[in-house]
């Protein structure tokens, strides 16, 4: 679970653990549950009162190379008449995920874990009203 | 794996794809430090499809703690503050990558794992099935 900082890596660990040089960790990037499919309700991005679009970002030095980002279509929310109601706000919902970054330094290659913030979808919220004195 | 552009001056022996196993620096880089993430919010309470958060703990996973959303209602909150069952609160789910200790309990050996998490909820128009 937890990842120690570089150095001070003495462990009385089980013999079955692979040897790892100090300051790094062994990472198998063959993904467990690779073929798992999201069983999200159908077309919720279009049926939501705070609808969103998807954009695929692609980076060849990142694993996985494709990361999908959502963007809210409107500032307001869609009412029962299908019109935008600007008394309510469409806001993004975000989640962190891990990716592996490949870095080139001269002819040598190193790998770095990276936290990436993904916008997953949008929700409709009542706005916070700031009263001016 | 994915193809990596190679420095033309480097030897050709380098694999263009990500290898199956890599040695990774222990320090995690945070790509979000210069952004202004909106995740720090009280949307869970202000949403028309509010949700509660549950602390999902797994010591063999990194991160070991993930907060998961559960929609509070089947319907959505209307302008009067009541639950409107003509609309549905549904979870917004996302596949994220985490690290799984492999072999189990090993401190510095991991495998990537894809998991499905519920991040929040959104209010949708229901799909109406007409019975013939």
């Amino acid at each position: 679970r937890k990842i120690p900082k570089v150095g001070h890596t003495f462990f009385q660990k089980p013999e079955s653990c692979p040897p790892v040089p100090g300051g790094s960790m062994k990472l198998d990037i063959g993904i467990i549950n690779e073929n798992q499919r999201v069983s999200m309700s159908r077309n919720i991005e279009s049926r939501s009162t705070s609808p969103w679009n998807y954009t695929v970002t692609w980076d060849p030095n990142r694993y996985p190379s494709e990361v999908v980002q959502a963007q809210c279509r409107n500032l307001g929310c869609i009412n029962a008449q299908g019109k935008e109601d600007i008394s309510m706000n469409s806001v993004p919902i975000q989640q962190e995920t891990l990716v592996v970054r490949r870095k080139h330094q001269g002819c040598s290659v190193s790998f770095q874990l990276e936290k990436v913030l993904v916008t997953v979808g949008c929700t409709c919220v009542t706005p916070v009203i700031h009263h001016v004195q | 794996g994915i193809t990596i552009p190679r420095n033309p001056g480097c030897p050709n022996s380098e694999d263009k794809n990500f290898p199956r196993t890599v040695m990774v620096n222990l320090n995690i880089h945070n790509r979000n430090t210069n952004t202004n993430p909106k995740r720090s919010s009280d949307y869970y309470n202000r949403s028309t499809s509010p949700w509660n958060l549950h602390r999902n703990e797994d010591p063999e996973r990194y991160p070991s703690v993930i907060w998961e959303a559960k929609c509070r209602h089947l319907g959505c909150i209307n302008a009067d503050g009541n639950v409107d069952y003509h609309m549905n609160s549904v979870p917004i789910q996302q596949e994220i990558l985490v690290l799984r200790r492999e072999p189990p309990h090993c401190p510095n050996s991991f495998r990537l794992e894809k998991i499905l998490v519920s991040v929040g909820c959104t209010c949708v128009t229901p799909i109406v099935h007409h019975v013939a």
Partner: antibody, heavy 119, light 107 residues
């Protein structure tokens, strides 16, 4: 630098409630979990529960579920713990502590709030 | 709940001594153990995290080791300012639990 400033000592009557505060300084309040820990000579250090100010989520030690309520106010970067139906057993020093969810350890602690429940 | 059994409860030391404190978990907690120092009237201060990693600014006379259920904390060449209570703590699974503490006292 990072600091967790806790409210001052409290002397309260049995049956009453008290709300302890912990103000975060020197970092983004919503990025880390806040945990609360009780210390007494008899039971030592006991983990009470956690709140994530970023998403409002809470989790409790079953032993404190009916005793403590954790809240957070982002506008003032302050975490609160309300203790209800107080008895002499609730006397002790209460600490707030910051937990790094990714790295997985408690790094900074508040100075503690001494609570005395006595008639 | 995971029980952390810490021994000894008291240690009589002289400056320059090497002292060792042990902590035994009632079930495996992998490397998820921290060690804290607490002086009278102060809050606990993190010394070691993940069983063996010194926290920023902690002198290298403080070391930790262990894995699974058995953990050891050592102070090499005890100094006067090290007289305090030391606690182990597991954050492998909640409710997070602490050892009973070891008080270092002057001989």
């Amino acid at each position: 630098q990072v600091q967790l400033q806790q409210s001052g000592a409290e002397l309260v009557r049995p049956g009453a409630s008290v709300k302890l505060s912990c103000k975060a300084l020197g970092y983004t309040f919503t990025d880390y979990e806040f945990h609360w820990v009780k210390q007494t000579p008899v039971h030592g250090l006991e983990w009470i529960g956690v709140i994530h100010p970023g998403n409002g989520g809470t989790a409790y030690n079953q032993n404190f579920r009916d005793k403590a309520t954790l809240t957070a106010d982002k506008s003032s970067s302050t975490a609160y713990m309300e203790l209800s139906s107080l008895t002499s057993e609730d006397s002790g020093v209460y600490y707030c502590t910051r937990f790094l969810t990714y790295e997985g350890y408690f790094d900074y602690w508040g100075q503690g709030t001494a609570l005395t429940v006595s008639s | 709940n995971i029980v952390m059994t810490q021994t000894p409860k008291f240690l009589l030391v002289s400056p320059g001594d090497r002292v060792t404190i042990t902590c035994k978990a009632s079930q495996s907690v992998s490397i998820d153990v921290g060690w804290f120092q607490q002086k009278p009237g102060q809050s606990p201060k993190l010394l070691i995290y993940h069983a063996s990693n010194r926290y920023t600014g902690v002198p290298d006379r403080f070391t930790g080791s262990g894995y699974g259920t058995d953990f050891t904390f050592t102070v090499n060449t005890v100094q006067a300012e090290d007289l305090a209570v030391y606690f182990c703590q597991q954050d492998y699974s909640s409710p997070y639990t602490f050892g009973g503490g070891t008080k270092l006292e002057l001989k």
